[in-house]
């Protein structure tokens, strides 16, 4: 269309970058560069990332998409969010399991494995903090149980058993001699 004045672009901003001969507009997230633009400040030829690949950001030079990660079944990982053209698979642990980092300085990209959460109920204890990012935090013994060593012991149901100091305090009675 004769006479229309083209917008100025100088390759310096985020909008256009020099690709090949010209400053070109980049490809949107989820697309890769098939061919650079064929005129100044033109649109590059961009194609959607194929299945099982992604590109999370607008880009100017990526001529292929990144392969989606597979969650590590050996480490009991599951996919919390499936891979899309714009985002990688988000791996995590299924309900009742928690993330145990394999490195000391743990960040979101660190390798990890999934551990089953402690079942406080099975240990006859109160659940103080539910298991998600770390293991369950169990509290005191449930009613009808008292602390004995590392565990919770059921209150005696008859007078035949002995009931030490802690038992008596929790279970509410002392064996008569």
């Amino acid at each position: 269309q004769g006479g229309t004045r083209s917008p100025r672009c100088d390759c310096a901003g985020d909008f256009h970058k020099k690709i090949g001969l010209f400053c070109c507009r980049g490809c949107p997230a989820g697309h890769y560069l098939k061919a650079p633009c064929t005129e100044p400040c033109g649109n590059s030829t961009c194609l959607v990332c194929p299945q099982d690949t992604f590109l999370a950001w607008e880009n100017h030079h990526n001529s292929e998409c990144a392969r989606c990660q597979a969650c590590d079944e050996q480490a009991s990982q599951v996919a919390l969010e499936n891979c899309s053209a714009v985002a990688d698979t988000r791996c995590g642990c299924k309900p009742g399991w928690f993330v145990e980092c394999q490195v000391s300085q743990c960040v979101s990209s660190s390798p990890f494995y999934c551990q089953p959460c402690l079942d406080c109920g099975a240990l006859h204890r109160h659940t103080r903090l539910l298991c998600s990012r770390r293991d369950t935090d169990c509290g005191t013994c449930l009613p009808g149980f008292y602390e004995h060593g590392d565990g919770c012991v059921s209150c005696p149901t008859s007078t035949l058993g002995s009931c030490p100091e802690r038992c008596a305090a929790v279970c509410g009675w002392r064996q008569m001699f």
Epitope: K18, G20, L21, F22, T38, P40
Partner: antibody, heavy 123, light 111 residues
């Protein structure tokens, strides 16, 4: 003094292949985009291919796309044109040209040309 | 593709006279206020030579009798006073967008 010297032309049968070379001297080869332009006997000029400086992206018209490839070896100051699946209509003198960029407008003009090399496609 | 059409196809001009060659693009070759087109001269048996770039800028070493004008879609190459060595074919070419395209050429002869 800028010099461009083409070589590799000759007689080839239809369907055959040929690789043209262009030896450059007298300028910083790696800093320039480079082109091939052809001229059929008694006819006008036709752009065949361009390769960018730096990232070496290549460009072709539809008439040669998927048959020709352009490449460069900056360490040897040499431009190449690989021509496959040649046809009778590819018969022409092939010129190598330097593309000079003017100003900040991403505007190119071919400011130096070689003498050309003749490619004849015939059975 | 942008089609470049030159007129006339051939031209005969007397020595010392003005020669004018026209070139029309099928769409505008303007970008950011610059006309992305150039003129080449090709003498018999020689490669083309750049004469004019950006429609009106004379390449260094080219005699000042050569000039270019025009914008948008219509362009003119003018030789103010024809010399014997100006006998050649003249081509316009656009660099606005790929594929780069040339005019069909204008053959300039001496009358």
């Amino acid at each position: 003094e800028v010099q461009l010297v083409e070589s590799g032309g000759g007689l080839v049968q239809p369907g055959g292949s040929l690789r043209l070379s262009c030896a450059a001297s007298g300028f910083t080869f790696s800093s320039y985009a480079m082109s091939w332009v052809r001229q059929a006997p008694g006819k006008g000029l036709e752009w065949v291919s361009t390769i960018s400086d730096g990232d070496s992206y290549s460009y072709f018209p539809d008439s040669v796309k998927d048959r020709f490839t352009i490449s460069r070896d900056n360490s040897k100051n040499t431009l190449y044109l690989q021509m496959n699946s040649l046809r009778a209509e590819d018969t022409a003198v092939y010129y190598c040209a330097r593309d000079r960029i003017y100003g900040s407008v991403q505007y190119y003009a071919m400011d130096y040309w070689g003498q050309g090399t003749l490619v004849t496609v015939s059975s | 593709d942008i089609v470049m059409t030159q007129s006339p196809d051939s031209l005969a001009v007397s020595l010392g006279e003005r020669a004018t060659i026209n070139c029309r693009a099928s769409e505008s070759v303007e970008f950011s206020g610059t006309s992305l087109m150039q003129w080449y001269q090709q003498k018999p048996g020689q490669p083309p030579k750049l004469l004019i770039y950006a429609a009106s800028n004379v390449e260094s070493g080219v005699p000042d009798r050569f000039s270019g004008s025009g914008s948008g879609t219509d362009f003119t190459l003018t030789i103010s006073s024809l010399q014997a060595e100006d006998v050649a074919v003249y081509y316009c070419q656009q660099s606005r967008k790929l594929p780069y395209t040339f005019g069909q050429g204008t053959k300039l002869e001496i009358k």
